[in-house]
C-alpha cells in the first residue's frame, strides 16, 4: 500500500481553519490479522528523509492524535484532548484521512506528516508517510481562504473529485 | 503529561501466582498501546508482552506464553500481568511502558520487583 | 527471534572522551531501531529513535546512524551524567527484542 498527499502545499490566513487530507492507496489488506494505525505529527525536511523526526503538533504527540482500526473503516479522535487544542483527526471509508486545525495562527506553519502503520499480527509493522507544507500568513499578502497546491504526482481527477475536502 | 506506577511486586514460591497493576495518570490512556517488560538482577530487557489500545491484538514472549496474562481496563487508567506458574527465571523488575504502532518504549514506569524462591 | 548484539560489554572511558558503541542486528530491521539508556536503579530512558533520531529532551553530544544490521551510538564527549548502560531494541518484528546491553564506566 502507498499514502497519497493530494496537495503538498496548503497557504492559509491566519484566524482559518484548515484540514490536512492523506489518502491511503494500493491493495489494503481486510484481514483479521492486520490493522491499521494513522496519525499525525509535525517534521522538518530532513537531508536523509523527510518525516523522520516526530514533532508535537500544538503539544499534542502523534499518540495523542492517532487513529486505530482496520482497513478502509470510518473513525475519529475520541477523546476531547486534541478539540480542547482546536484539532480533529478524522478517517473516512476510503482510505482519507485528515486532521482538521482550527483558528491557525503563524506558529502553525511547518511540515506537517501522516502516518500509516500497517500492523501484521504476530509478525510485522510496516509504515508509510506522506508530507505537506502549511504556510499560516497575515496581512494584506494573506490570501482570504486556504488555497491548495496539488502535488506532482496526484493526478488531475482525484484533486478535483476530492477537492471539497480542503477548503475550510 | 501520563506517568506510570507499577505495582502488585513480591516474594512468591515456585509454581504460586501474582498479579502485577500498572496505574496510568492522564485521560488518554485508553490511546495508548502498553507493553511490560523485566529485568532480571544485574541482566538485561527482556520485553513480555504487549497489549493494543482497545485490548485486542495481544502479544506475548515465548518464554511466558501460556503462563501470564496481559490485560487492562481503560474506564482505571490500569494495565495489569496475571502471572502464574511462577518460575525462579521470573525473578525481575517488571516494568510497563507505553509501546505504540511505528514507536518504541517512550514511558516507563519505575519498576515492581518480583522475586520466586522458595 | 531478531538477535540483537552489542559491543563492546563494557567501555572504560573517561569524562571528555569520545564514546562509540555498536550494536549488530542478525537480520535486517531496516531503521526501526532505539537506543535507550538506563542508570542505576532507574528506568530506561528513550535516547534515539528510527536509528539516527534524538528523542525530546536528549542532548546534541548523542548521535546515531546506520541501517539495516550495523548500528552505531556516538556520545561525543562523555558527560558525568552519561556513565550508564545502553540499550539497543529492534521493532521491526515480533518479538520486540534488546541488545544485552554496553556498560559505560568510568576510568
Known amino acids: 500500500f502507498k499514502v497519497a498527499t493530494p496537495y503538498s502545499l496548503y497557504v492559509c490566513p491566519e484566524g482559518q481553519n484548515v484540514t490536512l487530507t492523506c489518502r491511503l492507496l494500493g491493495p489494503v489488506d481486510k484481514g483479521h490479522d492486520v490493522t491499521f494505525y494513522k496519525t499525525w505529527y509535525r517534521s522538518s525536511r530532513g537531508e536523509v528523509q523527510t518525516c523522520s523526526e516526530r514533532r508535537p503538533i500544538r503539544n499534542l504527540t502523534f499518540q495523542d492524535l492517532h487513529l486505530h482500526h482496520g482497513g478502509h473503516q470510518a473513525a475519529n479522535t475520541s477523546h476531547d484532548l486534541a478539540q480542547r487544542h482546536g484539532l480533529e483527526s478524522a478517517s473516512d471509508h476510503h482510505g482519507n484521512f485528515s486532521i482538521t486545525m482550527r483558528n491557525l495562527t503563524l506558529l502553525d506553519s511547518g511540515l506537517y506528516c501522516c502516518l500509516v502503520v500497517e500492523i501484521r499480527h504476530h509478525h510485522s509493522e510496516h509504515r508509510v508517510h506522506g508530507a505537506m507544507e502549511l504556510q499560516v500568513q497575515t496581512g494584506k499578502d494573506a490570501p482570504s481562504n486556504c488555497v491548495v497546491y496539488p502535488s506532482s504526482s496526484q493526478e488531475s481527477e482525484n484533486i478535483t473529485a476530492h477537492h471539497h475536502h480542503h477548503h475550510h | 503529561q501520563v506517568q506510570l506506577v507499577e505495582s502488585g511486586g513480591g516474594l512468591v514460591k515456585p509454581g504460586g501466582s501474582l498479579r502485577l497493576s500498572c496505574a496510568a495518570s492522564g485521560e488518554t490512556f485508553s490511546d495508548y498501546y502498553m507493553s511490560w517488560i523485566r529485568q532480571a538482577p544485574g541482566k538485561g530487557l527482556e520485553w513480555v508482552s504487549e497489549?493494543?489500545?482497545?485490548?485486542?491484538?495481544?502479544y506475548y514472549a515465548d518464554s511466558v506464553k501460556g503462563r501470564f496474562t496481559i490485560s487492562r481496563d481503560n474506564a482505571k487508567n490500569s494495565l495489569y500481568l496475571q502471572m502464574n506458574s511462577l518460575r525462579a527465571e521470573d525473578t525481575a523488575v517488571y516494568y510497563c511502558a507505553r509501546d505504540e504502532p511505528g514507536w518504541y518504549f517512550d514511558l516507563w514506569g519505575r519498576g515492581t520487583l518480583v522475586t520466586v524462591s522458595s | 527471534e531478531i538477535v540483537l548484539t552489542q559491543s563492546p560489554a563494557t567501555l572504560s572511558l573517561s569524562p571528555g572522551e569520545r564514546a562509540t558503541l555498536s550494536c549488530r542486528a542478525s537480520q535486517s530491521v531496516s531503521s526501526y531501531l532505539a537506543w535507550y539508556q538506563q542508570k542505576p536503579g532507574q528506568a530506561p530512558r528513550l535516547l534515539i529513535y528510527?536509528?539516527?533520531n534524538r528523542a525530546t529532551g536528549i542532548p546534541a553530544r548523542f548521535s546515531a546512524s546506520g541501517s539495516g544490521t550495523d548500528f552505531t551510538l556516538t556520545i561525543s564527549s562523555l558527560e558525568p551524567e552519561d556513565f550508564a548502560v545502553y540499550y539497543c531494541?529492534?521493532?521491526?518484528?515480533?518479538?520486540?527484542?534488546f541488545g544485552q546491553g554496553t556498560k559505560v564506566e568510568i576510568k
Open positions: 531494541q529492534q521493532r521491526n518484528n515480533w518479538p520486540r527484542t
Open positions: 497489549i493494543s489500545n482497545s485490548g485486542s491484538p495481544i
Open positions: 528510527d536509528a539516527s
